[in-house]
Amino acid sequence: CGPGRGFGKRRHPKKLTPLAYKQFIPNVAEKTLGASGRYEGKISRNSERFKELTPNYNPDIIFKDEENTGADRLMTQRCKDKLNALAISVMNQWPGVKLRVTEGWDEDGHHSEESLHYEGRAVDITTSDRDRSKYGMLARLAVEAGFDWVYYESKAHIHCSVKAENSVAAKSGGCFPGSATVHLEQGGTKLVKDLSPGDRVLAADDQGRLLYSDFLTFLDRDDGAKKVFYVIETREPRERLLLTAAHLLFVAPHNDSATGEPEASSGSGPPSGGALGPRALFASRVRPGQRVYVVAERDGDRRLLPAAVHSVTLSEEAAGAYAPLTAQGTILINRVLASCYAVIEEHSWAHRAFAPFRLAHALLAALAPARTDRGGDSGGGDRGGGGGRVALTAPGAADAPGAGATAGIHWYSQLLYQIGTWLLDSEALHPLGMAVKSS
């Protein structure tokens, strides 16, 4: 969201660094929330859950199938999706070489206790030429393909695993917890979950200047959600922001002074990284030492300042999950500048993509003042509107409080995400992007 100009340009394809032997990404244990999540139980051929496994007949993948049972081809849909994506990457990286799977689902007890191989969530992979010098890069490609945990486990293979299909963490979208606070124009703060159309909240423009912007709607809203949030903490000043992996946060360029404002770079478009200006990063890619923008009081003046990230941890919160959208596309949550957008790591693209939505909202506001809160059918609320409000959403979309709200991802967001999956490379989309059903 937000700062279109000044918040960057199209990134060049990043240089991929191979994993080192015994390295794993993310740098947490495999069966923790931040990686593939807990073991859910062995799946055998005659168990009820066996139907959760699907065979992978991708001709671009070589399956070793040493058991001659076809077991290595069986995996969960999520594992299959990531593996198929990786197969393409491998062929692009090394023409003439294919992805090779040495172990998939295992029914023979060849692995350690509670191995994710037993539930079809893990694969051991090599390149078809079994060239050991390629394995570090193969592991990196697996990370980029969206596997939830990748481990350069053996000199003879890479181990990759995914979250369970029904895992909360597997479908994290891009949100803040309901306990997060925003600053209101009339003074004071408000919990993000309590926002309603008409509220004007603190945001920042494309030059990094603070301003108040209209809260339009929730792009995603799930009151009962229990999600895994990245906890990003700064020390000076001490601030703490929780947001899901796929949400965007603005990071200062290396040369940004400790006192300056976010500097504008010429041209518009998404962040480029480097010294051109602040760039939007997925929360899951923010690292300690990088600097985010926080509100600071200086000489009675409120302004944005870069603050070094002290720690990035994970926390499971049951406070619901909310993705507020402002007209500006940015928002200050817990005094930290964040994008309103998630899933796509190109902030200004996302902001432009929502232009039709903002325009429609503005038109409706002009035509029916005080009636542009997101409508449902019946169901009143504490703001004007009632049953005769102008509906700005498709049925079933996420609604603002007091608007006959039904939870979920906004239909416009879902539409854009679907288009994005067709048009954008996987690098631009976060692997934990949307709670779309597996087909």
């Epitope: 032997y21 070793k64 040493e66 040495t102 051991d124 090599t126 079994r130 060239d131 050991r132 010098s133 053996s154 000199k155 003879a156 293979h157």
Partner: antibody
Framework: EVQLVESGGGLVKPGGSLRLSCAAS????????MNWVRQAPGKGLEWVSS????????YYADSVKGRFTISRDNAKNSLYLQMNSLRAEDTAVYYC????????????????WGQGTTVTVSS | SYELTQPPSVSVSPGQTASITCSGD??????ISWYQQKPGQSPVLVIY???KRPSGIPERFSGSNSGNTATLTISGTQAMDEADYYC??????????FGGGTKLTVL
């Protein structure tokens, strides 16, 4: 008890042939890759040949390629080494050894060895 | 063909640490196993996959493999550790190969 017992060694003239056998017991023979390793008198260990448990991969050292043939009979829990065109430099103690790796993607080292059988090639 | 180089002999006093090296091109790309062989006996696997110890092998035996050199370390060496030690390399595309062996003498 896990055991490997080699047999078939003896004295043979250069150019002659000999067939070594290795009888396995106490483990699931078909699940293991099997090897022949030799040791010339006063010298070090030299790997000769391997028969993988997986997909019947067979490997030979350059020094014996084309002359020696490894085979296995899982039904009989036996490993064999057919040695043809023997040379004086083939004189050694021949050991049979197992490995639970498949030699394609997994290797764990030879954890069980036989006592060896002596082959002497001399005119 | 691939070659592994070991020192012919290493001497150590009882209770001291003995280190036996094994060198070869890009050795860290390969898995190293170490074998102990006492006179008149068959070899015994003491380390596999660079650093792992089979059951029954004392904790004083340890292995490492980095760059072009693998090392077998015996801490608190005992007289019973006197033997020939062989390193052996494996990767998925090359045949097995043994080093020339190192005679460990416990003084």
């Amino acid at each position: 008890e896990v055991q490997l017992v080699e047999s078939g060694g003896g004295l043979v003239k250069p150019g002659g042939s000999l067939r070594l056998s290795c009888a396995a017991s106490g483990f699931t023979f078909s699940s293991y890759s099997m090897n022949w390793v030799r040791q010339a008198p006063g010298k070090g260990l030299e790997w000769v040949s391997s028969f993988s448990s997986s997909s019947s991969y067979i490997y030979y050292a350059d020094s014996v390629k084309g002359r020696f043939t490894i085979s296995r009979d899982n039904a009989k829990n036996s490993l064999y080494l057919q040695m043809n065109s023997l040379r004086a430099e083939d004189t050694a103690v021949y050991y049979c050894a197992r490995d639970r790796g498949d030699y394609v993607d997994y290797y764990y080292g030879m954890d069980v060895w036989g006592q060896g059988t002596t082959v002497t090639v001399s005119s | 063909s691939y070659e592994l180089t070991q020192p012919p002999s290493v001497s150590v006093s009882p209770g001291q640490t003995a280190s036996i090296t094994c060198s070869g091109d890009k050795l860290d790309y390969k898995y190293i196993s170490w074998y102990q062989q006492k006179p008149g006996q068959s070899p015994v696997l003491v380390i596999y996959q660079d650093i792992k110890r089979p059951s029954g092998i004392p904790e004083r035996f340890s292995g490492s493999n980095s760059g072009n050199t693998a090392t077998l370390t015996i801490s608190g060496t005992q007289a019973m550790d006197e033997a020939d030690y062989y390193c052996q390399a494996w990767d998925s595309n090359t045949p097995l190969v043994f080093g020339g062996g190192t005679k460990l003498t416990v003084l």
